[in-house]
Amino acid sequence: AELFLIASPSHPTEGSPVTLTCKMPFLQSSDAQFQFCFFRDTRALGPGWSSSPKLQIAAMWKEDTGSYWCEAQTMASKVLRSRRSQINVHRVPVADVSLETQPPGGQVMEGDRLVLICSVAMGTGDITFLWYKGAVGLNLQSKTQRSLTAEYEIPSVRESDAEQYYCVAENGYGPSPSGLVSITVRIPVSRPILMLRAPRAQAAVEDVLELHCEALRGSPPILYWFYHEDITLGSRSAPSGGGASFNLSLTEEHSGNYSCEANNGLGAQRSEAVTLNFTVPTGARSNHLTS
């Protein structure tokens, strides 16, 4: 009688299961008591001798490529050996590498966690993932693992992390890069500083007073609100960052506390109050303002 080793599938892909069957045509194992054993090169596989003519291999890897055969032994100790079967495990090259971010969209708050997720649509076996910063490519980290995705983490993002990033994946068929992903670090506004600017040292009624509010840090656009005794005077926008000014034609009622607020959608900050007082100099007919 002949004995055959049948591998199904016969040309497995890395990571996929394979069933080895030790087949004796025209003879059911129930027709006679047989023990079966499967071998790779010179090593027995699985449980060794068993009454089952099948052996399940949960996942085949490139290093499992080799020469396989099986043996069947009757109760009378006669051993049949199959021909050797070469099983070549096929490695799928990496393809369609992409870089995604968490949070999505590449916008992250300063101090928050940023994760750069490198993924491949296809690829088997040990895949090496590498992350690079900048179009020139400063290597940040590399990881080798048997999965289609890998992560690089920046636990607390700084302003200097705002850059373009890309990743590369490779499993023995040459490197495959992702596209560039831009990271924007969103910075909440700092506490703004309010400055009062008058055309002269002693501003008079009907002079134009400039209220200048500026937050030294914060991602644009920044919206500034101006207040007199907590009553809104108006707002000004700074689309590219920096400060903004609000002009006021002075009257006697403009004495009191002034403040401003900066808001860029990531939080609002209020300035310290600046007090503006009218003073009446001796012998002068007109009122003057001092701050």
Epitope: E2, T21, P25, L27, Q28, S29, S30, D31, R83
Partner: antibody, heavy 119, light 108 residues
């Protein structure tokens, strides 16, 4: 493309021996996973497996016909043959040769040849 | 010996309808070693399904096989005119290969 072709006399006298040959083209009969079999079909009836052979010469027969059947192989000619002795009218049938890997399902068949047993 | 019994003996249906052919074994078929063949008049049988449910090369996906143990089914989801023929099941799990007696699928 694998092809199998049966040949032999279409008429055999009762009690004599039926002899058929199957010529294989498009593949070697010595391919080490294939068995080569004979199947017959009486007119208007179903299919009956007669037996099979491996290129090494190992044979496997239907127990109901075993005492009258001999299947042999000639690897040099890429042929295998069937001999069925002591035929009767019940042996009148279309005889097919076919290939089956590991002795499993028949995936390639000849077109069949009708053998009539006359009394 | 595993005896295969096919039912019905004849099935009369119209094109476009669904056909269900049954093959029952007298004992469990080893490792699901069961195949289905189609035979048209004057032609050799043609392999359609093997290993219970795997379609042979070139067989349209309207043909499907299912079952295990002793009960097996060939289903033709939507009959085409060329599907009307005789269908045989075959088991190859032991020392004796056997065929069913066939189901004739005819146009109603």
């Amino acid at each position: 493309q694998l092809q199998l072709q049966e040949s032999g006399p279409g008429l055999v006298k009762a009690s004599e021996t039926l002899s058929l040959t199957c010529t294989v083209s498009g593949d070697s009969i010595s391919s080490n996973t294939f068995y080569w079999g004979w199947i017959r079909q009486p007119p208007g009836k179903g299919l009956e497996w007669i037996g099979s052979i491996y290129y090494s010469g190992s044979t496997y027969y239907n127990p109901s016909l075993k005492s009258r059947v001999t299947i042999s192989v000639d690897t040099s000619k890429n042929q295998f043959s069937l001999k069925l002795s002591s035929v009767t009218a019940a042996d009148t049938a279309v005889y097919y040769c076919a290939r089956h890997e590991y002795g499993d399902f028949f995936d390639y068949w000849g077109q069949g040849t009708l053998v009539t047993v006359s009394s | 010996e595993i005896v295969l019994t096919q039912s019905p003996g004849t099935l009369s249906l119209s094109p476009g309808e669904r056909a269900t052919l049954s093959c029952r074994a007298s004992q469990s078929v080893s490792s699901n070693y069961l195949a289905w063949f189609q035979q048209r008049p004057g032609q050799a049988p043609r392999l359609f399904i093997y290993g219970v449910s795997s379609r042979a090369t070139g067989i349209p996906d309207r043909f499907s096989g299912s079952g295990s143990g002793t009960d097996f089914t060939l289903t033709i989801s939507r009959l085409e005119p060329e599907d009307f023929a005789v269908y045989y099941c075959q088991q190859y799990g032991g020392s004796l290969i056997t065929f069913g007696q066939g189901t004739r699928l005819e146009i109603k």
